[in-house]
Interface confidence: low
């Protein structure tokens, strides 16, 4: 809202002013009257009934300071110019408005000539008599502005060319875009420009503890004509560890913060830190309590998680599933993921190292966020160390580290992979495979085969191979085969038992 | 013709209450400010009240003020006052008369009070 | 006490003529507000005589006349006869009260 700057106020006087009138003693009076039981003072004329008015009230000379465009308030009064005797031919309803800019006060000396013609004014609502019955005369109010004045004083005049006119109200005054503070920027009070169509630029200065944020504009608004603040640039923001309040930025209380120049208020200190200054930018971790790099000041202080809570490694032939549960303190992130890592010891002479390179892992051993793994191509009859190991993202912080360990022997090769290569009525060929690495810890292959439905006898016949031909059979005879390994350390885990068919006397031509 | 006539007076206790009625006829009464004018026995007329015509503008004597009230109803054509905590210095007689408000302007004629009832008389005695 | 001041009584032998003073102040006849003149026959209600100073309704004789001049007002009556015998009240206004309208005291006029 613009703030007005008054010069001059009539209204406000009590009669006081003293204004000149012309001619003297005749047209323009000042009087008296009664408005919602408070006496009033208005200058009034009414001359209506004779022709060729001239009636001039002039007032006291205005000195004008720092504006540059005044604005002139009026409030007054028109009679009806039918509720005079024959409607008064010579009656106005109008009356004119004049300035004069001078450097010093002419006193009684009036030169009309002096004077420019700022408008005339007419009223939106004229008075007539039932309005005068009711004690309600209409007022009027019109405002006029002129600009830019350069002179160090001015006067207004009043010129009645024949109504009956009442002013009760002139106000002169001059428009400041008032002293504001917005976006926490503080803007000076300024004298509104002469030129409606300008716009002052005024720069802003940031309120004690705010700043222009990070590639922000300065702040800036524009003074108006009218004395309103138009087209706000910029702004600024409370400072890391200021907040708003108002419009200042006031310090973070004790246990609050504020990192960073932003609107945001300060917020509480985070569990497990300790409590803060006045003004924190951050809230310091207790002892124990971690922030990773990543982390925002807002988020809880954390620490690396206790070990896996349980751990099972279950030997299944050469190949081992690991199984654990998260750990019961995460240390309060979720970020948690498991490394599992491998070690191998020959019974023999205990010598033991890594065996990353020798084992296959269901998927990567590293950053896993399931809580199971599946080793596999493990060699037999050695001893193998499995350690889980939990990390979380403020692990890195400490030298200590979270895990569980489990062992398993594998004391059997894996069961081999057992193939019906081909068939006859009286033969069945069969092949077999052991992953690679076992190969080498394996003697002889011993095949076991019977009948089915015979459990009182069987067939074993051993081979260094990883193929067989089964002959002597009886046609069109389901029998059972089984494979097993066999090693320096004894027999190896034994393959699945299959059932394999030969071929009847009539398929037999195929 | 313009007449104005009163009625409600009466005997009424110190502390009681009385409302007067002033019936218009013969003019637009919507159009006329309207008093309140008494007369207390062997002595000179009181203003009492005033009422714009729209009722927007009222006033009191001093010596009624917070006591009575004055209101009309320009569809009935009706002036009342209702007056309460009566006291024996309110006896007299209440007249009613149509009002044009004096002027500031010169020129302008002030017909002041130009129509009056034939008055009701309200006595207040214990 | 009223706030304009009359004289309490006057009188006049039938056809001389008589006036009644009506004297206030700065702050009601002195300030410019109207003077208006009532005639109180006895056992009546008042009747509007002079209005805004000077000017007779219709249908008063023109032997009334009313005159205003600074602080003062005042009612001459020409050629008396018995029936003006009556109190007589002037009214105007007064920016310093409440409501604003004042009456005289009010003058008793015998016609001997």
């Known amino acids: 809202q613009g703030k007005e700057v008054v010069l001059l106020d009539f209204a406000a006087a009590g009669g006081e002013l003293g204004w000149l009138t012309h001619p003297y003693g005749k047209g323009w009076d000042l009087m008296q009257n009664i408005m919602n039981d408070m006496p009033i003072y208005m200058y009034s004329v009414c001359n209506v009934m004779s022709g060729d008015q001239d009636n001039w009230l002039r007032t006291n000379w205005v000195y004008r300071g720092e504006a540059e465009r005044i604005f002139i308030e009026l409030k007054f009064t028109v009679r009806d110019c039918n509720s005079f005797p024959g409607g008064a031919s010579s009656c106005k309803e109008t009356f004119n408005l004049y300035y004069a800019e001078s450097d010093l006060d002419y006193g009684t000396n009036f030169q009309k000539r002096l004077f420019t013609k700022i408008d005339t004014i007419a009223p939106d609502e004229i008075t007539v008599s039932s309005d005068f019955e009711a004690r309600h005369v209409k007022l009027n109010v019109e405002e006029r502005s002129v600009g830019p004045l350069t002179r160090k004083g001015f006067y207004l005049a009043f010129q009645d060319i024949g109504a009956c006119v009442a002013l009760l109200s002139v106000r002169v005054y001059y428009k400041k875009c008032p002293e504001l503070l917005q976006g926490l920027a503080h803007f000076p009070e300024t004298i509104a420009g002469s030129d409606a169509p300008s716009l002052a630029t005024v720069a802003g200065t940031c309120v004690d503890h705010a700043v222009v944020p990070p590639g922000g504009e300065e702040p800036r608004m524009h003074c108006a004509v009218d004395g309103e603040w138009l087209v706000p640039i910029g702004q600024c923001l409370c400072q890391a560890g200021y907040e708003k309040v108002e419009d200042a930025c006031q310090a973070c209380s004790p246990g609050f913060f504020k990192f960073e120049a932003s609107e945001s208020p300060c917020l509480e200190c985070p569990e497990h830190t300790l409590p803060s200054p006045e003004g924190a930018t951050s809230c310091e971790c207790e002892e124990g309590f971690f922030r990773a790099p990543q982390d925002p000041a807002s988020m809880p202080c954390t620490r690396p998680p206790s070990a896996p809570h349980y751990l099972t490694a279950v030997g299944m032939g050469a190949k081992v599933e690991l199984r654990w549960t998260p750990p019961q303190d995460s240390g309060g992130r979720e970020d948690i993921v498991y490394s599992v890592t491998c070690e191998q010891c020959w019974p023999e002479s205990g010598e033991c190292g890594p065996c990353e390179a020798s084992v296959r892992y269901s998927e990567p051993p590293h950053g896993l966020t399931r809580t199971s793994v599946t080793v596999s191509d493990l060699e037999p009859h050695m001893n193998y160390t499995f350690t889980v190991e939990a990390r979380n993202g403020v692990s890195g912080l400490v030298t200590s580290r979270s895990f569980r360990t489990a062992s398993v022997s594998i004391n059997q090769t894996e069961p081999p992979k057992v193939r019906l290569e081909g068939r006859s009525t009286t033969s069945l060929s069969v092949s077999w495979s052991i992953p690679p690495p076992q190969q080498s810890r394996v003697w002889k292959y011993e095949v076991t085969y019977r009948k089915k439905g015979d459990s009182n006898s069987y067939n074993v016949r051993r081979t260094e191979g990883f193929s067989v031909t089964l002959d002597d059979l009886a046609p069109d005879t389901t029998y059972l085969v089984q494979v097993q390994a066999l090693t320096q350390e004894g027999q190896g885990a034994g393959s699945k038992v299959h059932e394999f068919q030969t071929l009847s006397p009539e398929g037999s031509g195929n | 013709e313009v007449q104005l006539v009163e009625s409600g007076g009466g005997l009424v206790q110190p502390g009681g209450s009385l409302r007067l009625s002033c019936a218009a006829s013969?003019?637009?009464?919507?159009?006329?400010?309207m008093n309140w004018v008494r007369q207390a026995p062997g002595k000179g007329l009181e203003w009492v009240s005033y009422i714009s015509s729209s009722s927007s503008t009222i006033y009191y004597a001093d010596s009624v003020k917070g006591r009575f009230t004055i209101s009309r109803d320009n569809a009935k054509n009706s002036l009342y006052l209702q007056m309460n905590s009566l006291r024996a210095e309110d006896t007299a007689v209440y007249y009613c008369a149509r009002y044009r408000f004096p002027d500031f302007w010169s020129g302008y004629p002030n017909y002041g009070m130009d129509v009056w009832g034939q008055g009701t008389t309200v006595t207040v005695s214990s | 006490q009223s706030v304009l001041t009359q004289p309490p009584s006057v009188s006049g032998a039938p056809g001389q003529r008589v006036t009644i003073s009506c004297t206030g102040s700065?702050?009601?006849?002195?300030?410019?507000?109207?003077v208006h003149w009532y005639q109180q026959l006895p056992g009546t209600a008042p009747k509007l005589l002079i209005y805004g100073n000077s000017n007779r309704p219709s249908g008063v004789p023109d032997r009334f006349s009313g005159s205003k001049s600074g602080t003062s007002a005042s009612l001459a009556i020409t050629g008396l006869q018995a029936e003006d015998e009556a109190d007589y009240y002037c009214q105007s206004y007064d920016s310093s009260l409440s409501g604003h309208v004042v009456f005289g005291g009010g003058t008793k006029l015998t016609v001997l």
């Open positions: 013969g003019f637009t009464f919507s159009s006329y400010s």
């Open positions: 700065s702050s009601n006849i002195g300030a410019g507000y109207d």
